[in-house]
């Protein structure tokens, strides 16, 4: 176990032309915060894929207001380190994503607005216990300068935090073949050596000489990937040739839970139910009580004060797991209707609604037809967060209260004269034309072009347009 630490030194415009505009203004003051996401190995995974090694969010930085006319300077940063605890061995190779977020502090409806300013990513090799590594990454016109390191939490030591240190049994020296644990010179390295050849990336051990595999790997030395598509031969599954099984061994095969813990498969991983007095991803940590603070993310610990009594973490909304270590993104399925913005506040979901909508999930159309009357026989039509009236002939305007001039658009063709009428308009056609809008020429022999004149109407009579 250990902690990955990230120190942000500066975030501001990068060198070269095209300096970015300041993200904050006098009208919209804002402050920055950072998110780091770590994944094991040198994978080039999508930014959305899980942060399998862990993730952390910084505190909010100081409020910043742009000075008018000044170029964007290095922006004020949050205090402190970003710390990502890891429970198992440090993988040595890792991928990172660092995101810079802006929190606008103007008069926002429903709380502050967040937007992603920049995202940088990289793949690095890093030994635990080493010095701070410095880095510069650019995202568009922005530049991020930072340092990072991985350090082991006692009693773990070593480049992967897999060796354990124990207090000396004798005051003067360590036992045969055991070295002092630098920098803890008063402690000695515990004799924990995994089976020779055990994969340092995919295997681990909790007892000397063993080699236990992380999920996705199998074989005596954890060097064989399981459940890959190459396992299928034309005659069906074959484990002899490829060393893999289909269906692949489940994550609970071989029981990764230590100290008598029982394993259950979860949708994508496994979970250990630990006996009293143990906790951790694999029940590897002993003698834990509520006094040790085993519940993460604000979980409430309930249990006895002595190491033999079990504790239970009651997780706040948005977290789960035996130690409330798993975060749930409840906005993932877009619960906010009508284009509302979803905010997972931890204790609750909140929707910031677009103009024209309201309600806990933005489900209410404020401008709908409820209680809206269209005058003079008009009918109300809903749509897009607004309502409109479809007006009866002779009326117009938002609520059909205005008398429309049906002749305004000059509807009578070929010089016909237009007369407003209570049910619409009437065209008095010029000689030689007929039809509701005087659109049909009259032939010399008295026959008209299609359509035929209605009975009782002579060419040249006024035509009522309904």
């Amino acid at each position: 176990a250990g902690v990955f630490e990230l120190q942000i030194h500066s975030f501001g415009p990068g060198p070269g032309p095209g300096a970015p505009r300041s993200p904050c203004s006098a009208r919209l003051p804002c402050r920055l915060f950072f998110r780091v996401c770590l994944k094991p190995g040198l994978s080039e995974e999508a930014a959305e894929s899980p942060c399998a090694l862990g993730a952390a969010l910084s505190a909010r930085g100081p409020v910043y207001t742009e000075q008018p006319g000044a170029p964007a300077p290095d922006l004020p940063l949050p205090d402190g380190l970003l710390q990502v605890p890891f429970r198992d061995a440090w993988p040595g190779t890792f991928s990172f994503i660092i995101e810079t977020w802006r929190e606008e502090l103007g008069d926002q409806i429903g709380g502050p607005a967040w937007s992603l300013l920049a995202r940088v990513a990289g793949r690095r090799r890093l030994a635990a216990g080493g010095p701070w590594a410095r880095d510069i990454q650019r995202a568009g016109a922005w530049e991020l300068r930072f340092s990072y390191r991985a350090r082991c939490e006692p009693p773990a030591v070593g480049t992967a935090c897999t060796r354990l240190c124990r207090p000396r049994s004798a005051p003067s020296r360590c036992g045969p073949g055991l070295r002092p644990c630098a920098p803890l010179e008063d402690e000695c390295e515990a004799p924990l050596v995994c089976r020779a050849g055990c994969s340092p990336e995919h295997g681990f051990c909790e007892q000397p000489g063993e080699c236990r595999c992380l999920e996705g790997w199998t074989g005596p030395l954890c060097t064989v990937p399981v459940s890959t598509s190459s396992c299928l031969s034309p005659r069906g599954p074959s484990s002899a040739t490829t060393g893999c099984l289909v269906p692949g061994p489940g994550p609970c095969d071989g029981n990764p839970c230590a100290n008598g813990g029982s394993c259950s498969e979860t949708p994508r991983s496994f979970e250990c139910t630990c006996p009293r007095g143990f906790y951790g991803l694999r029940c590897e940590v002993s003698g834990v009580t509520c006094a040790d603070g085993p519940c993460f993310n604000g979980g409430l610990c309930v249990g006895g004060a002595d190491p033999d009594s079990a504790y239970i973490c009651h997780c706040p909304p948005g977290f789960q797991g035996s130690n409330c270590e798993k975060r749930v993104d409840r906005c993932s399925l877009q619960p906010c209707r009508n284009g509302g913005l979803c905010l997972d506040l931890g204790h609750a979901l909140r929707c910031r609604c677009r103009a024209g909508f309201a309600g806990p999930r933005c489900e209410h159309d404020l401008d709908d037809c409820a209680g809206r009357a269209c005058a003079n026989g008009g009918t109300c039509v809903e749509g897009g967060g607004a309502h409109r009236c479809s007006c009866a002939l002779g009326f117009g305007g938002r609520d059909c209260r205005e008398r429309a001039d049906p002749c305004a658009a000059r509807p009578c063709a070929h010089g016909g004269r237009c007369y407003a009428h209570f049910s619409g308009l009437v065209c008095a056609c010029a000689p030689g034309y007929m039809g509701a809008r005087c659109e049909f020429p009259v032939h010399p022999d008295g026959a008209s072009a299609l359509p035929a004149a209605p009975p009782g109407l002579r060419p040249g009579d006024p035509q009522r347009y309904l």
Epitope: E45, S49, S229, G248, S264, P267, E271, S332, L333
Partner: antibody
Framework: QITLKESGPTLVKPTQTLTLTCTFS??????????VGWIRQPPGKALEWLAH???????RYSPSLKSRLTITKDTSKNQVVLTMTNMDPVDTATYYC????????????????WGQGTLVTVSS | DIQMTQSPSSLSASVGDRVTITCSAS?????MYWYQQKPGKAPKLLIY???NLASGVPSRFSGSGSGTDFTLTISSLQPEDFATYYC?????????FGQGTKLEIK
Amino acid sequence: QITLKESGPTLVKPTQTLTLTCTFSGFSLSTSGMGVGWIRQPPGKALEWLAHIWWDDVKRYSPSLKSRLTITKDTSKNQVVLTMTNMDPVDTATYYCARIVSFDNDVVSAMDYWGQGTLVTVSS
Amino acid sequence: DIQMTQSPSSLSASVGDRVTITCSASSSHSYMYWYQQKPGKAPKLLIYLTSNLASGVPSRFSGSGSGTDFTLTISSLQPEDFATYYCQQWRSNPFTFGQGTKLEIK
């Protein structure tokens, strides 16, 4: 628009192997967070989860049927295939495939879109 | 295995009634999922992550609960709500469903 459709034989004989294909559109199994699962429902009975597969090829099987089930995906064809060996009349059911979404490492957000289902009868 | 027990197994109610269906799990878990199924049709997601309404589901449906006891509530029954309702847990394999609650017109 997201759709899923199950296809396969409607009648199989006891001891035979059933192969069902789920063809989907509107999402991709190369996208992080996406999965496809199989669920069945014997006539007049409750739903039973069988298996699922994730974008990164992590698979899960119902323990009581694990020895008989295999789930695979063909990302380029937008298909997931479930094979079930040694069929028995008690396996007669409507078989559904459904999209599963997980935006967190180990928490299912939802099984939000389902196919119409295909009725498979096991009889000699 | 986590057993999911729904109650009641069947229920008669009238349009406009407030209806509550409960689902009890044999061991504690974090989230519940609810589905509605009509005869001859595929199940439809109603509630995910215990209390979140799926897209297109009317706001008269709501979900609540934690630990082992979870509830689906329909605030005012509509004719189209008469169907069978299932709960499901995604905590531990096998990912089990409840036996169903059939909601019928009184």
